[in-house]
């Protein structure tokens, strides 16, 4: 059982460890979003991606996640079993993003540009809200991430 | 070799109470989430509830909630449903499945057990 | 709450292309499954993740999921084809596993 995104192959990680985590906390990470209207992780994003893209994709995406969401918001809360959780996560991210290698030839530059549109689409939702509005409704959006990565996932 | 095999089933009369039960074998059953999914004569599959592989997390169809409750033992790589006032819409063929993904990838399915609720 | 909608029944000739289709809000941005219930048996996943195959399951299945209508493909339908067909989705919003209403497929 492994995740293959396009020519990338990522092994040991456990999905079942990675919902377990996000669901122990996403009641109160989607109680204390307010801001219903707007989306991260948009259509967009995640609509369509090809095998070849998803690599670079999923690569960008969880390096957001580890130095930009995680971090912050490790630094917010006390609360211990909202720690460990998000310490599953992280802890699972780093390692999928250490067997993710995207080629950086020249003939797959249209591939990656077009992934790192997408991320851009991302990352400018969340610099549209306020930083603790931003982190927050990131972590309630873990499911949404989740969810799409099923699709590169292999039995 | 994977097995998942239900028991429990009967002939229960309107706001009678049953306990389904799934025994696991041929796999690490606290590694799994869990699901039960029933289906009625002449209807089609119904998901019921499911259950995170800790036991931590357990989620209802609307149909189900305040009457059913999902448990495991994962010392007993045992599966359970507990249901309360039953009624006759809950007749049907119960299900177990095995999520291998946390999140509705049912990849194995037991045989079934029949529940009927009648007077 | 999510739904997925399919037709009641389709058909196809011995050896001809069938297609399920099975319709959903924006269901090509969740995970698509599909299971195949033939009468007094249990359901078997034929396909998962849109468009993956379970060990032992014929080539002749494939799927695809885009937009709003995920697609079941039998190539070649055989007569041990005939059967009920689900499809099904996790939504994460409701934390609930969706079913499609089911296809029958009757191969002439």
């Known amino acids: 059982q492994e995740f293959h995104f396009g020519p990338c192959q990522v092994k040991g990680v456990v999905p079942q460890k990675l919902w377990e985590a996000f669901w122990a906390v996403k009641d109160t990470m989607q109680a204390q979003d307010n801001i219903t209207s707007a989306r991260l992780l948009q259509q967009e994003v995640l609509q369509n991606v090809s095998d070849a893209e998803s690599c670079y994709l999923v690569h960008t995406l969880l390096e957001f996640y580890l130095k930009t969401v995680f971090k912050n918001y490790h630094n917010r809360t006390v609360e211990v079993r909202t720690l460990k959780s998000f310490s599953t996560l992280a802890n699972n991210f780093v390692l999928i993003v250490s067997q993710l290698q995207p080629s950086q030839e020249n003939e797959m530059f249209s591939i990656r540009d077009s992934a790192h549109r997408r991320f851009l689409l991302f990352r400018r939702a969340f610099k549209q809200l306020d930083v603790e509005a931003a982190l927050t409704k990131a972590l309630g959006e873990v499911d949404i991430l989740l969810t799409w990565m099923q699709k590169f996932y292999k039995l | 070799q994977l097995q998942l095999v239900e028991s429990g089933g009967a002939l229960v009369q309107p706001g009678g109470s049953l306990r389904l039960s799934c025994a696991a074998s041929g796999f690490t059953f606290d590694d799994y989430a869990m699901s039960w999914v029933r289906q009625a004569p002449g209807k089609g599959l119904e998901w019921v509830s499911h259950i995170s592989g800790n036991g931590e997390s357990t989620f209802y169809a609307e149909s189900m909630k305040g009457r059913a409750t999902i448990s495991r033992d994962n010392a007993k790589n045992t599966l359970y449903l507990q249901m309360n006032s039953l009624k006759s819409e809950d007749t049907a063929v119960y299900y177990c499945?095995?999520?291998?993904?946390?999140?509705?990838?049912?990849?194995?399915w037991g045989q079934g057990t029949q529940v009927t609720v009648s007077s | 709450s999510y739904e997925l909608t399919q037709s009641p029944s389709v058909s196809v000739a011995l050896r001809q292309t069938a297609k399920i289709t099975c319709g959903g809000d924006?269901?090509?941005?969740?995970?698509a499954q599909w299971y195949q219930r033939k009468p007094g048996q249990a359901p078997v996943m034929v396909i998962y993740?849109?468009?993956r195959r379970p060990s032992g399951i014929p080539e002749r299945f494939s799927g695809s999921n885009s937009g709003n209508t995920a697609t079941l493909t039998i190539s070649g339908a055989q007569a041990e084809d005939e059967a009920d067909y689900y499809c099904q989705v996790w939504d994460s919003s409701a934390n609930a596993a969706v079913f499609g209403g089911g296809t029958h497929l009757t191969v002439l």
């Open positions: 924006n269901i090509g941005s969740k995970s």
């Open positions: 499945a095995k999520d291998d993904y946390g999140s509705g990838l049912y990849a194995y």
């Open positions: 993740s849109d468009n």
